[in-house]
């Protein structure tokens, strides 16, 4: 066992001589991003105060390529890197094409309306005028490609002109535009060369030891890894913690059960019911508030102040009133819950599917004409699954070196 342990320790650390170094650097596991849109069926009726009705469309599947660059080994047992992602549409795996049209809430208009709710009426009437002049409406009919990667909108230029630096988009607005061909921030993680117990744990993100998006030290902490590998020798008592730049927070997954993936023993980690619970149900989450119903997390503080919410798809594990407020939602544990299957000895993921939903809080705001008589509602925009499974040569090498060899050495 000590020999096996030595073999594992030697091969999991972030070091060019390590067996898993290239796997860490390039991630040979094919990742796929599957996006499901909520097509709004009754936009005119919603403006009149009726209940929203949506139809799930998709999946629209993209192959996700990841590579680390600017890899710099520091002298405090850490390594810094930028990880870039690019996405390539996969027509054969998709149910539809990127030119499919989807009716969606106009995030810029309805988001701005909620943000302006407590501002002076004159300012809200200016907004009405501006939206009118620019031809902006509460709902828009855009292609999948436009929603994902960006569409030209005069409002983007207007926001950038009058509120410089507030908005991460330059001339196009797209929900995934920031992710394509760009990095997710500078991660500095422990290599495990000197101290294996800290391997993969994040030391800093963008030079920060903690973020300032939230209202408590606990919620602002950068805990766990960067979400790709974890320290070895896990037990059922272990938790899977990682910092997600997209959610602007650390997340903790819990052990659920043991399993086997392609002959490799795994531990399945899943989201606890408390992940997106509000502060009144789970006090440690109070720092993420102000909260609406439980089961959705307000990410406005790190998403240009827009009233955007993160949750499980179809409001799974959330307050039932959320799913009941929108016709066409059907939360389902099997289809909508996330999981990561980890090889406990090495802390390397074998098979995973991280599923999250993005929603917009919208309502009628007095004086912003475009909001009509919309009843307050958290309306799902889309949900996505980021999935990957080890396969082929990588799987064979992994199985041989880290499962078969230790077994042989054991005997």
């Amino acid at each position: 066992p000590s020999l096996i342990k030595q073999q594992v320790l030697k091969n999991v650390r972030i070091d060019p001589s390590s067996l898993s170094f290239n796997m860490w650097k390039e991630i040979p596991i094919p990742f796929y991003l599957s996006v499901y849109f909520f097509d709004v069926m009754n936009p005119s009726e919603i403006l009149k105060g009726e209940k929203p009705q949506v139809r799930e469309r998709g999946p629209y599947v993209y192959r996700e390529f990841r590579h680390k660059s600017n890899i710099t080994f520091n002298n405090n047992d850490t390594v810094s890197f930028l990880e870039y992602r690019t996405f390539q549409f996969q027509p054969s795996k998709s149910h539809g094409s990127e030119s499919d049209y989807i009716v969606m809430p106009n995030i810029l208009v309805l988001g701005a309306a909620v943000m302006m709710e407590n501002k002076p009426m004159t300012l809200k009437l200016i907004m009405t005028l501006a939206f009118t002049t620019l031809g902006e409406r509460a709902f828009m009919n855009r292609t999948v490609g436009e929603i994902m990667w960006g569409y030209k909108d005069p409002l983007v230029n207007l926001i950038n002109k009058y509120f410089p630096g507030m908005f991460p988009f330059k001339d196009k607005f797209g929900l995934f535009a920031e992710l394509n061909n760009s990095d997710s921030g500078l991660f500095t993680v422990f290599t495990g060369v000197q101290n294996i117990s800290r391997i993969h744990l994040v030391d800093k993100w963008n030079g920060l030891s903690k973020v300032d998006f939230w209202h408590s030290d606990q919620c602002n902490m950068i805990n766990g890894t960067s979400g790709q590998m974890w320290p070895p020798f896990m037990t059922p008592e272990s938790s899977l913690e990682f910092y997600s730049p997209e959610a602007c927070r650390s997340m903790k997954l819990m052990y659920k059960e043991s399993g086997v993936f392609e002959g490799i023993p795994t531990y399945r980690f899943v989201a606890p019911k408390t992940l997106f619970a509000n502060g009144s149900i789970y006090p440690p989450n109070e720092g993420f508030c102000p909260c609406l119903e439980s089961g959705i997390q307000n990410v406005s503080t790190c998403r240009f102040s827009a009233p955007l919410f993160l949750s499980h798809p179809h409001f799974l594990n959330a307050d039932p009133v959320l799913a009941e407020a929108v016709t066409g939602l059907h939360p389902n544990q099997e289809a909508h819950s996330l999981f990561l299957d980890i090889h406990p000895v090495t802390g390397i993921p074998m098979n995973c599917s991280v599923k999250l939903q993005l929603s917009l809080y919208m309502k009628s705001v007095a004086g912003i004409g475009q909001t009509g008589k919309i009843e307050p509602v958290v309306l799902p925009l889309l949900w996505f699954a980021e999935s990957g499974a080890m396969e082929g040569e990588t799987l064979h090498t992994f199985y041989t070196q880290l499962v078969l060899m230790p077994k042989v050495m054991h005997y």
């Epitope: 004159t122 005028l129 509460a138 004086g367 475009q370």
Partner: antibody, heavy 125, light 110 residues
Framework: QVQLQESGPGLVKPSETLSLNCTVS??????????WGWIRQPPGKGLEWIGS???????YYNPSLKSRVTMSVDTSKNQFSLKLNSVTAADTAVYYC?????????????????WGRGTLVTVSS | QSVLTQPPSASGTPGQRVTISCSGS????????VNWYQQLPGTAPKLLIH???QRPSGVPDRFSGSKSGTSASLAISGLLSEDEADYYC???????????FGTGTKVTVL
């Protein structure tokens, strides 16, 4: 030329609901440049803005009357309406409907450029 | 009780110049454009001046408006008998969150 015409009962009993309609002709109520407003004038007194409504149904009201006022739009009839509940004698007035213009650039100039002739509503038992 | 104060009356002989003042505060005239309405006896009000000094088409250039600080004024030059009416100033009030009218000034042509 835009014209507005108020219609509704001239007499309303105390504690009941005052209901008025305003029909717009010579222009579409669905024009996105305008709200449509109601203003009243008690006999021998000054003008008081009640509230305004957009073609989408979006409203904003005078806070002093907000709890009792409801305004709505019927784009198919090119009409907008006013409901004022729990009326008292103090609500006796000539009620005008008017086109509420939002003009100007970053300084919004709100103004009422076209007015109906007005209808006298008396609150009395 | 109106927050925009006007003199109750003003008068002049035909051909004279009459000025009506409208006094407000920083939350109305001080921060928003002023409009003026003319109400002839027994008729609905009519927009006379908007955005402090702009005349809608059809309004004679005898009518002019100005604004300074928290006060505004309407001037009628070359007074005519047909100018006999009630005049109201108006502006949005940021504190009250309402469109407010002045107390009204009755102009009499002597």
């Amino acid at each position: 030329q835009v014209q507005l015409q108020e219609s509704g009962p001239g007499l309303v009993k105390p504690s009941e609901t005052l209901s008025l309609n305003c029909t717009v002709s010579g222009g579409s109520i669905s024009s996105s440049s305008y709200y449509w407003g109601w203003i009243r004038q008690p006999p021998g007194k000054g003008l008081e803005w009640i509230g305004s409504v957009y073609y989408t149904g979006n409203t904003y009201y005078n806070p002093s009357l907000k709890s009792r006022v409801t305004m709505s739009v019927d784009t198919s009839k090119n009409q907008f309406s006013l409901k004022l509940n729990s009326v008292t004698a103090a609500d006796t007035a000539v009620y005008y409907c008017a086109r509420h213009v939002l003009g100007g650039g970053w300084e919004v100039s709100q103004r009422f450029d076209y007015w109906g002739r007005g209808t006298l509503v008396t609150v009395s038992s | 009780q109106s927050v925009l104060t006007q003199p109750p009356s003003a008068s002049g002989t035909p051909g004279q110049r009459v000025t009506i003042s409208c006094s407000g505060s920083s939350s109305n005239i001080g921060s928003n454009p002023v409009n003026w309405y003319q109400q002839l006896p027994g008729t609905a009000p009519k927009l006379l001046i908007h955005t402090n000094n702009q005349r809608p088409s059809g309004v004679p250039d005898r009518f002019s408006g100005s604004k300074s600080g928290t006060s505004a004024s309407l001037a009628i030059s070359g007074l005519l008998s047909e100018d006999e009416a009630d005049y109201y100033c108006a502006a949005w009030d940021d504190s009250l969150n309402a469109y407010v009218f002045g107390t009204g000034t009755k102009v009499t042509v002597l």
